[in-house]
Interface confidence: low
Amino acid sequence: SLGSLTIAEPAMIAECKTRTEVFEISRRLIDRTNANFLVWPPCVEVQRCSGCCNNRNVQCRPTQVQLRPVQVRKIEIVRKKPIFKKATVTLEDHLACKCETVAAARPVT
């Protein structure tokens, strides 16, 4: 109704900036040759650029990034028993963002 429209708060643009996102630590980042293991934790928080730009010809993109090595557990299953090992995964955090012009996408043929 009209009444409910008048009390609704004004929409605020989700500006292009770094935000906390969840990054899944896939097993292939640890070991591409073996699938017989688990990774703990399965996901972590990273800083990533997201948000809107003022037109379709620009996208929110990182202008500065930093790599962050983190230690995870690689849990191998050997004869139905877990063997705990350590592995390092390098995460990419976005430090700064900018609305940048995007080249026209090539159509898939």
Partner: antibody
């Protein structure tokens, strides 16, 4: 044989434009992040730009931001560097290079550049 | 930006000598440090990645060490083909940066 072959270098006046190309062969180009590195006459190496395997992440050195644009065509196995508003200080040999390893384009550059082209010379002079 | 400082800028050595080149980062870069060799008129060649990992095909006389801000490239027994310029490069954060180079010359 894994190979990168740059082309497009030329003599150009200050303020002019140039597009460099880097043709890749002998490896799965679409799986690897790529880079441009330059070397001014008698000087050291300077990183210019990096682009992830899918082209979604592109980074530039401060000295070229806003003037140079890096792009790639994974269908043509070719990397490009569009250089606009060229300055005398952009005079250099420009190399394209492959980041190693290629399997993870999210953290694509932390193990260095393992394959390099022979370089193409860009001279900016009036 | 992270500054990379190499020393010495040049050195003279003889075949068989043990040569050490150092590289210092302006802030901690963990182990994200690579070493390259470049000969005149040629493209650089990756020698060491991740501070201490030997790139495939590189002779074992080359070794790298260090973490944080201080790194070292060592050539255990200098060979005639090793006379070249060596560069360190950080890959911890963009913009990626190189050291100024160390020219290894024949004594």
């Amino acid at each position: 044989e894994v190979q990168l072959l740059e082309s497009g270098g030329d003599l150009v006046q200050p303020g002019g434009s140039l597009r460099l190309s880097c043709a890749a062969s002998g490896f799965t180009f679409r799986s690897y992040a790529m880079s441009w590195v330059r070397q001014a006459p008698g000087k050291g190496l300077e990183w210019v730009s990096g682009i992830s395997a899918g082209g979604g992440y592109i980074y530039y050195a401060d000295s070229v931001t806003g003037r140079f644009t890096s792009s790639r065509d994974n269908y043509k196995n070719t990397l490009y560097l569009q250089m606009n508003r060229l300055r005398v200080e952009d005079t250099a040999v420009y190399y394209c290079a492959r980041f190693y390893p290629g399997y993870n384009s999210d953290t694509y550059y932390y193990d260095g550049m393992d394959v390099w082209g022979q370089g193409t010379t860009v001279t900016v002079s009036s | 930006d992270i500054q990379m400082t190499q020393s010495p800028s040049s050195l003279s050595a003889s075949v068989g000598d043990r040569v050490t080149i150092t590289c210092r980062a302006s802030q901690s870069i963990s182990s994200y440090l690579n070493w390259y060799q470049q000969k005149p008129g040629k493209a650089p060649k990756l020698l060491i990645y991740a501070a201490s990992s030997l790139q495939s095909g590189v002779p074992s006389r080359f070794s790298g060490s260090g973490s944080g801000t201080d790194f070292t490239l060592t050539i255990s027994s200098l060979q005639p083909e090793d006379f070249a310029t060596y560069y360190c490069q950080q890959s911890y954060s963009t913009p990626l940066t190189f050291g100024g180079g160390t020219k290894v010359e024949i004594k």
